[in-house]
């Protein structure tokens, strides 16, 4: 099973005197996701042509998933970083309901898709202990991310396989912009 | 062009203070976090203190928490490094330079000199 | 406290290319170290080279590369020039605080 970073002791300088808030560490659990996204998109890519298709924008209007925007503080101009903090906690609670429809989308790399689920919600909570301002924090309603995962599982092949790329190039989008923000910080 | 322009520096008594600023120009101020780093003569650099973008986060060295206040007013684009409580090994150069990111280096300012001595 | 290594010295002849490391106490690195290199020469400030494992700071001649190899930060200079006589140092983040190492005196002869 892959490896979360931190539980191996080579992974951190000084893995016991850094704060699980530290910069670095953040930093090295984002890696490790996108990581595990390219293993996920190359596995995705092989076997379906969806990388190549056109026809992304027909299924994008179908979801919605998070996205940067410059209201949101989080790029270099109109930087703010308690607006964009908040963005990236609630973009990451949003993407939870995407990352659950992805468990049951890929063969050989099962464990990997797993992974990236987990280590989300563990960065979800290392972001939370960082974030002052949690009263802005909207977590979607359980009921709303069950009838959107029912929807999503329902639709014909050719969506699914354009859902699951959708979803892992935006997810990967929203995890870089991130970076270079939290870096900031 | 950016510019990183230190001041403040000068001679203090152990145990006095002093208020470092750095006025920055050139690029979004307020989208960078910004450090202090000294060198003491003939020894490398040394990372002092770090301020987020925004100021909602400081973060200090050992040598000098509790001693040191790092700060910053983006309204005039300018940093600060408050010292308190100074000792004879904190003489050095005092540099401000901006955190690297948004696909943009470090840049340094030429330096004040802080001299503690009695 | 991890402490940040460098070679104390090192000497490369004009043209010649030389690589210079540098690696944590405990641990590896990592690109979330963001590892920067300075060059300094005497009387001078130190001046940005390379930001981000490998990034070149504007201005700085592409004879200056930067990489993380095995366990640790690196900085090739392919072709020495006099000129790079100088100190080096790279720098680190560790946790939530930023470590230089001890500096590297690279001669070029």
């Known amino acids: 099973a892959p490896v979360l970073p931190g539980e191996d002791s080579k992974d951190v300088a000084a893995p016991h005197s850094q704060p699980l808030t530290s910069s670095e560490r953040i930093d090295k659990h984002i890696r490790y996701i996108l990581d595990g996204i390219s293993a996920l998109r190359k596995e995705t890519c092989n076997r379906s042509n969806m990388c190549e298709s056109s026809k992304e924008a027909l299924a994008e209007n179908n979801l919605n998933l998070p996205k940067m925007a410059e209201k949101d503080g989080c790029f270099q101009s109109g930087f703010n970083e308690d607006t964009c903090l908040v963005k990236i906690i609630t973009g990451l609670l949003e993407f939870e309901v995407y990352l659950e429809y992805l468990q049951n989308r890929f063969e050989s790399s099962e464990e990997q898709a797993r992974a990236v689920q987990m280590s989300t919600k563990v960065l979800i909570q290392f972001l939370q202990k960082k974030a002052k301002n949690l009263d802005a924090i909207t977590t979607p309603e359980p009921t709303t991310n069950a009838s959107l995962l029912t929807k999503l599982q329902a639709q014909n092949q050719w969506l699914q396989d354009m859902t699951t790329h959708l979803i892992l190039r935006s997810f990967k989008e929203f995890l870089q912009s991130s970076l270079r923000a939290l870096r900031q910080m | 062009e950016v510019q990183l322009l230190e001041s403040g520096g000068g001679l203090v008594q152990p145990g006095g203070s002093l208020r470092l600023s750095c006025a920055a120009s050139?690029?979004?101020?307020?989208?960078?976090?910004m450090s202090w780093v000294r060198q003491a003569p003939g020894k490398g650099p040394e990372w002092v203190s770090r301020?987020?973008?925004?100021?909602?986060?400081?973060y200090y060295g050992d040598s000098v928490k509790g001693r040191f206040t790092i700060s910053r007013d983006n309204s005039k684009n300018t940093l600060y490094l408050q010292m308190n409580s100074l000792r004879a090994e904190d003489t050095a150069v005092y540099y401000c330079?901006?955190?690297?990111?948004w696909g943009a280096g470090d840049y340094w300012g030429q330096g004040t000199l802080v001299t503690v001595s009695s | 406290q991890t402490v940040v290594t460098q070679e104390p010295s090192f000497s490369v002849s004009p043209g010649g290319t030389v690589t210079l490391t540098c690696g944590l106490s405990?641990?590896?690195?990592?690109?979330?170290?963001?590892p920067g290199w300075y060059q300094q020469t005497p009387g001078q400030a130190p001046r940005a080279l390379i930001y981000s494992t490998n990034d070149r700071h504007s201005g700085v001649p592409d004879r200056f590369s930067g990489s993380i190899s095995g366990n640790k930060a690196a900085l090739t200079i392919t072709g020495a020039q006099a000129e790079d006589e100088a100190d080096y140092y790279c720098?680190?983040?560790?946790?939530?605080?930023?470590?230089f190492g001890g500096g590297t005196q690279l001669t070029v002869l």
């Open positions: 405990s641990g590896s690195v990592t690109a979330s170290n963001y």
């Open positions: 050139g690029f979004t101020f307020s989208s960078y976090a």
């Open positions: 330079a901006n955190r690297a990111g």
């Open positions: 301020i987020s973008a925004g100021g909602g986060s400081t």
């Open positions: 720098a680190l983040d560790i946790g939530d605080i930023t470590e």
